[in-house]
């Protein structure tokens, strides 16, 4: 390495590209600079994102893959960094930028949301999982009455474009639905999502967004919930949600309404089962909803509540109509 | 060697303002950005701001905006915090630190103690 | 703004024991970085990067975690380790933030 005593400049990288390599990413490419002396030191890299949002990070190797929204632009440099317990250097930045795509920003989107569910594949021998893609969206304030707009997905490697629409009273699409998708709800890559537009009367600007998949994953109910009583016990039991995830990643909720007095019991789990000291006169509904434990994923979204469950002793009948 | 010498402990009054320093040796501070944290006594660190002392641009926490003003100046290789109507909330050691990144600080300074008591 | 929780506040490890302490963030972050301070000197740069540790770190520590919960691990606890060790995120809205401290003293 590098004594304290000896100089050495360091020089930019050159040939600094940025290329669209698919739905919001990017591959930033760049050589070193062929003037510069090695001098048997470690050099590195030193990314910067400065737009759409700063960001930095250091690599040895010449190219970078990004995950990043586009629609607003994107502008990135890289110089040559050497840094150790006696050096600190770096060369000027190199720099390169795409521009934010033709169209006015207000004929874009508003609002895109979407949310993924989990079904079980019943065509498969073999358990496996479908994950399900459901997107809105509001029309842009200034676009045209002939715009029409598309959305596309992004998940790893794979992008599709949206086949079932619905529209509004003008015919534009404002949601989208993806019965069946290549996204892994166990997966931690990010779900890009764009949705471009037409219009004969102007350019539609496209927009696109990021979503982390447990941010907006739709967990489905617990499963047969059954609820017993036995002289002042009551005691529920359930099954883990149709879900990649197997049993041990679920917390629970356990919903107990007293309906004779309106106590509301609610109980924070990590088993299958719940037992509760009652009192023997009244009536109860119950109710379980999961979610992602923070063991297995980032936490989330909580399911739906469970149908409710009455037990309990059922004074106030309605009379039965014969 | 990298080094961040900070100018000495400062005892001023309430509603003053004071100049505090920060000369690197070892590397030029225009390849770096310079941050500012302030710890009060027996508490932890707070973030007060940056400056990318290559153009001048700053970014700041909300919280000290009104309060603090960092500058740089690559001629003298020196960073500087102003801090403006001083009050004894203000007594603190305030650390200049910097580095190649913006995620966190690979050099501290020494600190610089202001007191502010009447 | 991004708050982020060090647990305990104060603990006490013996030498040769395993330490761990914790850094909860009230969201998701993409790294957490450590700093070690000792008292009346400036903080140190110990982590970085969640798990990367910085020059002259000796190889008993660790760091690890992801989203919002992240730690520091000692494997084999010394007494030039007894510090106070601040987490801190940064994300590219200001401000940066760093948690409250753990104390780790030596028993």
């Known amino acids: 390495d590098l004594l304290p005593d000896e100089k050495i400049s360091l020089l930019p990288p050159v040939n600094f590209t940025i290329k669209v390599t698919g739905l919001a990413q990017v591959l930033l490419q760049w050589k070193p600079n062929p003037d510069q002396e090695q001098r048997n030191v470690n050099l590195e890299y030193q990314v910067k994102i400065n737009a759409p949002k700063e960001d930095d990070y250091e690599t040895r190797i010449t190219e970078s893959k990004c995950v990043t929204i586009l629609h607003k632009g994107f502008s990135a440099s890289v110089r040559t960094i050497l840094q150790n317990d006696h050096s600190l250097l770096a060369s000027s930045w190199a720099s390169a930028e795409l521009h934010a795509p033709p169209g006015s920003p207000g004929t874009s989107i508003v609002n895109l949301t979407c949310t993924t569910n989990t079904t079980e594949d019943n065509y498969s021998r073999l358990r496996s999982y479908q994950v399900s893609l459901h997107c809105t969206w509001l029309v842009g304030t200034d676009a045209p009455e002939d715009t029409q707009y598309f959305l596309y997905y992004r998940y790893g490697s794979w992008t599709e474009e949206c086949q079932e629409y619905s529209k509004d009273t003008l015919g534009r699409n404002i949601a989208c639905w993806f019965p069946r998708t290549f996204i892994l709800s166990k997966g931690r890559d990010w779900l890009a999502v764009l949705v471009n537009g037409s219009s004969k009367h102007s350019a539609i600007r496209p927009f696109d967004q990021l979503f982390a998949l447990h941010a907006i994953d739709q967990i489905n109910p617990p499963l047969n919930v059954t609820a017993e009583i036995e002289g002042t016990r009551l005691s529920i039991q359930w099954e883990k949600p149709v879900s990649a995830f197997p049993i041990h990643c679920f917390d629970y909720e356990v919903k107990i309404h007293n309906t004779r007095n309106g106590y509301l019991q609610i109980e924070k789990l990590m088993t299958n089962a719940f037992i509760s000291i009652i009192d023997d006169l009244s009536k109860y509904d119950v109710q379980v909803r999961a979610a992602v434990s923070s063991m297995c994923r980032e936490a989330g979204l909580w399911s739906e509540w469970s149908q409710p469950i009455y037990v309990g002793n059922d004074e106030h009948k309605p009379l039965r109509e014969w | 060697e990298v080094q961040l010498q900070q100018s000495g402990a400062e005892l001023v009054k309430p509603g003053a303002s004071v100049n505090l320093s920060c000369t690197a040796s070892?590397?030029?501070?225009?390849?770096?950005?310079m941050h500012w944290v302030k710890q009060r006594p027996e508490q932890g660190l707070e973030w007060i701001g940056r400056?990318?002392?290559?153009?001048?641009?700053?970014k700041s926490d909300p919280k000290f905006q009104a309060k603090a003003t960092i500058a740089a100046d690559t001629s003298s290789n020196t960073a500087y915090l102003q801090l403006s109507s001083l009050t004894s909330e203000d007594t603190a050691v305030y650390y200049c630190?910097?580095?190649?990144?913006?995620?966190?600080?690979?050099?501290w300074g020494q600190g610089t103690t202001l007191t502010v008591s009447s | 703004q991004i708050v982020l929780t060090q647990s305990p506040a104060i603990m006490s490890a013996s030498p040769g024991e395993k330490v761990t302490m914790t850094c909860s963030a009230s969201?998701?972050?993409?790294?957490m970085h450590w700093y070690q301070q000792k008292s009346g000197t400036s903080p140190k740069r110990w982590i970085y990067?969640?798990?990367k540790l910085a020059s002259g770190v000796p190889a008993r520590f660790s760091g690890s975690g992801s989203g919002t919960s992240y730690s520091l691990t000692i494997s084999s606890m010394e007494a030039e380790d007894a510090a106070t060790y601040y987490c801190?995120?940064?994300?590219?809205?200001?401000?940066?933030?760093f948690g409250g401290g753990t104390k780790l003293e030596i028993k």
């Open positions: 400056i990318d002392p290559a153009n001048g641009n700053t």
């Open positions: 969201s998701s972050v993409s790294y």
């Open positions: 990067d969640t798990s």
């Open positions: 801190q995120q940064w994300s590219s809205n200001p401000p940066i933030t």
């Open positions: 070892g590397f030029n501070i225009k390849d770096t950005y």
């Open positions: 630190t910097g580095g190649l990144r913006l995620r966190f600080f690979d050099y």
